[in-house]
Amino acid sequence: EWVKFAKPCREGEDNSKRNPIAKITSDYQATQKITYRISGVGIDQPPFGIFVVDKNTGDINITAIVDREETPSFLITCRALNAQGLDVEKPLILTVKILDINDNPPVFSQQIFMGEIEENSASNSLVMILNATDADEPNHLNSKIAFKIVSQEPAGTPMFLLSRNTGEVRTLTNSLDREQASSYRLVVSGADKDGEGLSTQCECNIKVKDVNDNFPMFRDSQYSARIEENILSSELLRFQVTDLDEEYTDNWLAVYFFTSGNEGNWFEIQTDPRTNEGILKVVKALDYEQLQSVKLSIAVKNKAEFHQSVISRYRVQSTPVTIQVINVREGIAFRPASKTFTVQKGISSKKLVDYILGTYQAIDEDTNKAASNVKYVMGRNDGGYLMIDSKTAEIKFVKNMNRDSTFIVNKTITAEVLAIDEYTGKTSTGTVYVRVPDFNDNCPTAVLEKDAVCSSSPSVVVSARTLNNRYTGPYTFALEDQPVKLPAVWSITTLNATSALLRAQEQIPPGVYHISLVLTDSQNNRCEMPRSLTLEVCQCDNRGICGTSYPTTSPGTRYGRPHSGR
């Protein structure tokens, strides 16, 4: 049976004066020689040789200073051996407890703690939790840390409360005001022995977050400006406001609005995000003849909603703005503001180039006459079909059109014409609508049964031919008006749905005749231009065979009647 005792040892002290600090004996010692051996940490394991045993007596001595934080207790394995080196007892585990001394200060987990809290937060709102540890014995006074605020910057009324035991930083009042102090620096100490022992300091940086608790206020009580009629302005006036909330945030950013006077939507207010100024813009021209001055009322709020702490105090405060409209000499304008041109029915979509639509001149509003010293150009010109003469304002086609063009909407193409005053550079815009027909690009054509007839019986059958089946019979055959001062020479009589008889109404001399024929189908569709039929009338012999041939481009070419020459 073992007989044992062990005294606790204090760290950081020379405990050798109290040796032996432990003793082991076996009751077998009374009957035989016993040798004592010890092993374990501090003996034959690092740190080596702290404990030694007297092999004969079993006295255990301490030989070195120990550190509790390194080894809170030593477990010594003890053996009692007989002369043969055999254990006479079961090995004994002897515990030597190391007593703590306060040799470690508290250590904060961060040298600087960062936190943030909204201004106007309720008192006792949690800001942050500080964290510190002490290496001394847990649950012992040596490691019990007490926190306290050493200093606050800016100084003055203490704004924060630090829980002595938990390290919680809370607001002391509900009067945090970012506009007074946007951040606080606390120096905090943590002392062990519940505040009486070793201490360490750390820093707490607390950012006071902005809330929208300040109303934007106009710097001036009223504003005024002057603007010429008929013009737009990207900056007529600037309004300055003061807002104490954090710059460049939505709490600071001003939103300007009209409370009255802008019923005509002439004005807009845009915020300059750099300066927070309101920029009054004229987006719709004013007319002096209708309005000589405009009395606006404006107000301002923020992009962000106001904080609940102040919202009940917000009132829309209108600030007057007087705009004086200045009369100017009237410029140029298109009257009416749009003009419609119509492409003649029957024009081919492939024969539009150089087709003249007409003129669209701007007028001088002072004289109500066609404007002089203006230059005309096309503005919007989808598809690029139209061109305007810079001086005469004559509009023509410069491009042929695909009948399926996406620019034809409701049989109309739309473009804009600009008139630029060469003195002032002012521009007026007119809208051009061009109504286009259903282009008859495959319109019916006429063919003569023969291209030569005898002068004795000058008649020939004309037949209608079509290139596609959109043109349906019956066809109407008509002769284009003969040149003025000439009596009608030819007549045409319908024979059936697709042909007619062309004949001379009187005896006519031999020659080559060009006869203009107009063909119209049952839907009243017709070609762009009359068909020009070339017919040779010749002197025939008694067998009805032509005797003379006439060149088609000679000066003697006939247009319905004999040509008298030059």
């Epitope: 003649q344 150089d354 005469t392 491009k399 231009m529 020009s532």
Partner: antibody
Framework: EVQLQQSGPELVKPGASVKISCKAS????????MHWVKQSPEKCLEWIGQ????????TYNQKFKAKATLTVDKSSSTAYMQLKSLTSEDSAVYYC??????WGQGTTLTVSS | DIVLTQSPASLAVSLGQSVTISCRAS??????????MQWYQQKPGQPPKLLIY???DVESGVPARFSGSGSGTDFSLNIHPVEEDDIAMYFC?????????FGSGTKLEIK
């Protein structure tokens, strides 16, 4: 079918004037500009000017402004070009044209003493 | 005035070959996405005949062997294959700005 029939060749003395005609048929005469082009013996083509047959409005190449006068007679669908103070430099073939797609056969003008 | 420089002044090709005639404008003849450039063929004793308009649109009735290309200031007329009937003078013309101007012409001959 569009046809432009021009008057015949002209032989005139220096300093005189000449009026060339161009009769249009087969299309709406007043709907398109009538252009006039000079082709000198070296074969190069020069645009003289254009006339709007509907209004009589003209646009000239600055080079020919003092030389040519363009007119029309709507009733006969005929365009005219008068050339004045003629010199040998004016000897050329003159064409009328409805844009580029229809041309007259050309009128040869010879200026010689 | 817009000056049109045509090249070459003349060229001789074998029948069946391809030929390209160039025309360079002193400034752009582009107008809202369309090049206002025409090409004409002229045979002796005849008026010019329109081949190509809008730089690349082939006039109706003109054989498919004629084609036009280019935009801005550089244009070309291509004939492929060349036939006997193509022996003629060829002119480019711009209608972007008054005065409308013509190139100096290219004479096409057969080898």
């Amino acid at each position: 079918e569009v046809q432009l029939q021009q008057s015949g060749p002209e032989l005139v003395k220096p300093g005189a004037s000449v009026k060339i005609s161009c009769k249009a048929s087969g299309y709406s005469f007043t709907a398109y500009y009538m252009h006039w082009v000079k082709q000198s013996p070296e074969k190069c083509l020069e645009w003289i000017g254009q006339i709007n047959p509907s209004t009589g409005g003209t646009t000239y190449n600055q080079k020919f402004k003092a030389k040519a006068t363009l007119t029309v007679d709507k009733s006969s669908s005929t365009a005219y070009m008068q050339l004045k103070s003629l010199t040998s430099e004016d000897s050329a073939v003159y064409y009328c044209a409805r844009w580029g797609d229809s041309w007259g056969q050309g009128t040869t003008l010879t200026v010689s003493s | 005035d817009i000056v049109l420089t045509q090249s070459p002044a003349s060229l001789a090709v074998s029948l069946g070959q391809s030929v390209t005639i160039s025309c360079r404008a002193s400034e752009s003849v582009e107008y809202y996405g369309t090049s206002l450039m025409q090409w004409y063929q002229q045979k002796p004793g005849q008026p010019p005949k329109l081949l190509i308009y809008g730089a690349s649109d082939v006039e109706s009735g003109v054989p498919a062997r004629f084609s036009g290309s280019g935009s801005g200031t550089d244009f070309s007329l291509n004939i492929h294959p060349v036939e006997e009937d193509d022996i003629a003078m060829y002119f480019c013309q711009q209608s972007r700005k008054v005065p409308y101007t013509f190139g100096s012409g290219t004479k096409l001959e057969i080898k």
